[in-house]
Interface confidence: low
Amino acid sequence: ELQKDSDCCSCHEKWVGYRCNCYFISSEEKTWNESRHFCASQKSSLLQLQNRDELDFMSSSQHFYWIGLSYSEEHTAWLWENGSALSQYLFPSFETFKPKNCIAYNSKGNALDESCETKNRYICKQQLI
Amino acid sequence: ARHCGHCPEEWITYSNSCYYIGKEKRTWAESLLACTSKNSSLLSIDNEEEMKFLTAILTSSWIDVFRDSSHHPWVTINGLTFKHEIKESDHAEHNCAMLHVRGLFSDECGSSKIYHCKHKL
């Protein structure tokens, strides 16, 4: 089965490669802003989820991780770091998220809005292709 | 530096290895065979850093370590003495090792657990 290779080039040391994306799954905790800055320093961004099973390689749901969603007062909407809008199908409860909060997510598909000053683990994502 | 890897689709890459993230449960012996059929080996733990990473993302799963009896040393399937601590239960018949969020533990080889496979690039 190993001959069925992915066409993607692999990721930096200590990053996880999965479906042509690279993920840095932190073991330390930072505030949302600190997490965002760290990801940027690694030429990546806080996780932007394409679908609810994007992290299905993570079977443990013991940790919540900051992801790259924040509320835009200008657009009165939750936006990913690249400016795209949050799909209502991803988190059915997003309308009740408090605009001042940031979003933490775990691999079970749970999303929480928490104070952005709370320290959580975080996931950075880089797309290879 | 980046290098181009050769992992099958739907496997993950991490630090020069490919990992198959299993969802199904098997006994330890069945897990060995399942990984062999995927041209890979049952999950092995090479260092503390890898163990820390795996315990963060995985639930309890078999690793490639066993012993013949409670009087024998823990060895890998390659026959090498296993150097990391395996927390042992009170049960003498627990002769296979599993990765757990709290570290490595012994368990009954015939019990069904999630398994993961690994292939070094």
Epitope: S61, F64, S93, K108, N110 | -
Partner: antibody
Framework: QVTLRESGPALVKPTQTLTLTCTFS??????????VSWIRQPPGKALEWLAL???????YYSTSLQTRLTISKDTSKNQVVLTMTNMDPVDTATYYC???????????????WGQGTMVTVSS | DIVMTQSPDSLSVSLGERATINCKSS????????????LAWYQQKPGQPPKLLIY???TRKSGVPDRFSGSGSGTDFTLTISSLQAEDVAVYYC?????????FGPGTKVDIK
Amino acid sequence: QVTLRESGPALVKPTQTLTLTCTFSGFSLSTSDLCVSWIRQPPGKALEWLALIDWNDDKYYSTSLQTRLTISKDTSKNQVVLTMTNMDPVDTATYYCARTIAAAGPYDAFDIWGQGTMVTVSS
Amino acid sequence: DIVMTQSPDSLSVSLGERATINCKSSQSVLYGSNNKNYLAWYQQKPGQPPKLLIYWASTRKSGVPDRFSGSGSGTDFTLTISSLQAEDVAVYYCQEYYSLRFTFGPGTKVDIK
């Protein structure tokens, strides 16, 4: 029959660490999908969830108290232990442990509770 | 975290009459993949631990009298006691278990008018 029983000191001094033990019978935390939580209730006030540990040793903590709490289990003794550091008089409460199941998605409700143990924090 | 609110704070109802308690969550507790509402109701009598009455918003726990019923979906939920009995005097709490933070409401005290 499933039962849970909390034990620990009735009185602790401010700044001390509280250690509470939940001893249970009728189920095992080595069984898939079973979990134990700690919940507290200050006198005359509402319930507050503190922490949960499941069969897989996954742990969850209250956001506001996560820096002070540690939950662990001893499967062979059928016990779950909660430690809470830097105790303060506002932590005076009845502390309960309760069982829950993770059968359909995240986790289920707390179906069986212990009787609770009253902890007073005072110098 | 999800915030749970309950109304009213307290409720006095005549024996045999209907008692209705409302619970609101600050975000939806409906889990899309199984279409279940992760909301429970508990009854707590003085000096006793809470007792689970209703889970999945509307499923009665085995052994709970059928005068207790739960309804609602998403963010708004109701516990109804169709015919109040003396032994129903207690504080009633709603709780969400969607978020892995297991937040409780502040409670509603029910007594007899």
